[in-house]
């Protein structure tokens, strides 16, 4: 039903859903701090633009008795319950920030007349792609898929002279919310990734993964998995690995690789880590002081959600346009705004663009080094290290299928 919005006459409210089920196990207090810090910045920016208006946030907490698992897999109805609560209280802001779980976002989007914008720190799954009033401020699965396909096909770099068309995907069902949806997208038979690969098999058991590492009859040398180095070590341990195996470890929201004193453990030498380029200023910020490197991105997405709203509010107010219109609801895309940590770009569908970084372990220094970067906005790979000190033969990435012979540049059309 249509709920009146507290969103006019110089007073603009943001509804922040504080859900028990969340993409990352972040104390709600930290998210509140991030939102409040964002509000301070927005107020300052509006004031500097000569706009004398009030911007506030209302935090909507769900009933912990009903939704207390903290697990996104059980979150389908929580968002709807919160919306009902908002509806009953007749308290809807100009914009909805949260939810972060794919299930609840999808359900809310399906079951409500969304005449207001929805900003999510999460909602990683493909089912939340191409939603007209949904903005996602953490890299969704679609962006990962496009990188992987781009990288698989690349065959003209000094360190990658074969295009690949095969892969194993390790997915055992215990993954974090981001990994769950990333791997889900790679597994889906109708996804772009599956469509572009000739062979893809999902490994679901630890033993399956462990056996592949030395199996002479394996169908691919490439294994994709998602998580941190510790997750890989628990699975792989110090087992021997065939020399032409390449493990791609997707670990987007983890800054630990970029700490100065980090040395790569020995078990990472056959691994390429895909992560996001680290921000510049976050380490000293007041809201992130208590956050682990993994959680920083989640709280930052809440903060940036507030800044995005402030950006759009400023534009609409300066143009004398109404905020409670479908035009406003559909405007949160195809733009760049000043985020907390520098410019943030949203694509045509409201999904954040970013620079992904592929790291390798130098056999000389045992340090992580950047192999290449990938710009999700233009779907392009930029090599950085033209002569990497790889563990692989001739310091080049192997073919994805052993014994394929000299099919040096097999192209896919």
């Amino acid at each position: 039903s249509q709920v009146s919005q507290n969103c006019h006459n110089g007073s603009y409210e943001i509804s922040v859903l504080m859900m028990g089920n969340s993409a990352f196990a972040e104390p709600l207090k930290n998210l509140e701090d991030a939102v409040n810090e964002g509000l301070e910045i927005v107020r300052g920016r509006l004031q500097n633009a000569g706009l004398n208006v009030t911007v506030n946030a209302t935090f909507m907490y769900s009933d912990g008795l009903i939704h207390n698992s903290g697990d996104c897999r059980s979150s389908t109805c929580e968002g709807l319950d919160l919306l009902r609560k908002i509806s009953n209280a007749q308290r809807m802001g100009c914009v909805l920030i949260g939810p972060s779980c794919t299930y609840s976002t999808f359900q809310m989007y399906l079951d409500t007349e969304l005449s207001y914008p929805m900003i999510s720190a999460g909602s990683f799954g493909l089912s939340c792609d191409y939603k007209e009033t949904l903005t996602r401020l953490m890299s969704p699965a679609r962006k990962l898929m496009y990188f992987l396909v781009n990288f698989w096909k690349t065959n003209d770099l000094p360190f990658k002279t074969y295009s690949w068309s095969t892969s194993y995907v390790y997915k055992n069902g215990t993954e974090t919310e981001d990994c769950f949806w990333y791997l889900n997208a790679l597994e889906a038979s109708v996804s772009y990734f599956s469509h572009e690969l000739g062979f893809k098999v999902v490994l679901r058991q630890d033993k399956e993964f462990q056996d592949i590492l030395m199996d002479h009859n394996r169908k691919s040398n490439v294994i994709i998995m998602c998580g941190g180095p510790e997750f890989l070590y628990k699975l792989k341990g110090d087992r021997a690995v065939a020399e032409d195996i390449v493990i791609i470890l997707v670990d987007l929201f983890n800054d630990q690789y970029f700490e100065d004193n980090v040395t790569a453990p020995d078990y990472m030498k056959n691994v390429l880590v895909l992560t996001l380029s680290p921000g510049n200023s976050l380490l000293n910020s007041s809201f992130s002081r208590n956050l682990s490197p993994t959680k920083r991105d989640f709280a930052l997405a809440y903060l940036n959600g507030i800044l995005l709203f402030g950006h759009m509010l400023k534009i609409f107010l300066e143009n004398g346009e109404n905020i409670t219109t479908p035009k406003f609801a559909h405007a949160f895309r195809n733009l760049t705004f000043e985020g907390y940590d520098g410019p943030v770009t949203l694509d045509d569908w409201g999904d954040v663009d970013s620079t992904m970084v592929l790291l390798y372990t130098s056999v000389d220094t045992k340090k992580y080094k950047v192999l290449l970067t990938y710009d999700t906005h233009v779907n392009k790979t930029y090599p950085v290290d033209m002569s990497p000190t790889f563990t692989w033969k001739n310091s080049k990435l192997p073919n994805d299928i052993t014994g394929r012979g000299p099919q040096h540049h097999h192209h896919h059309h």
């Epitope: 380029s277 000389d364 950047v370």
Partner: nanobody, 123 residues
């Protein structure tokens, strides 16, 4: 002795591309952060790109999406690939190096500088 020698400058039309090289000697690239700077006639020198010793590129907003940096340790050389060049990119381009105190951050200042190479973007 640390040395940096730039090359690859020249005259190019708007929308065109150039690749600048910075040949280095006297140090290991892995231990140094490298920056590309430029100075347009009558203007102050400005940072364009820095590559941290860990290999993380950091771009000035004015060149993001157009310029990219790479390095080849086997040749002790850094490259600045410049695409979609504009008239305002006309400048002398300098390569600079600094012993890295952090693997992932650009240094506040650089100790060693090359002589520069001129890039002119004009039709």
């Amino acid at each position: 002795e640390v040395q940096l020698v730039e090359s690859g400058g020249g005259l190019v039309q708007p929308g065109g591309s150039l690749r600048l090289s910075c040949a280095t000697s006297g140090f290991t690239l892995d231990d140094y952060a490298i920056g590309w700077f430029r100075q347009a006639p009558g203007k102050e020198r400005e940072g364009v790109i820095c590559l941290t010793s860990g290999g993380l590129p950091k771009y000035a907003d004015s060149v993001k999406g157009r310029f990219t940096i790479s390095r080849d340790n086997s040749k002790n050389t850094l490259y600045l690939q410049m695409n979609s060049l504009r008239a305002e990119d006309t400048a002398v381009y300098y390569c600079a190096a600094s012993g890295a105190t952090s693997r992932w951050n650009c240094p506040p200042q650089y100790d060693h500088w090359g002589q520069g190479t001129m890039v002119t973007v004009s039709s």
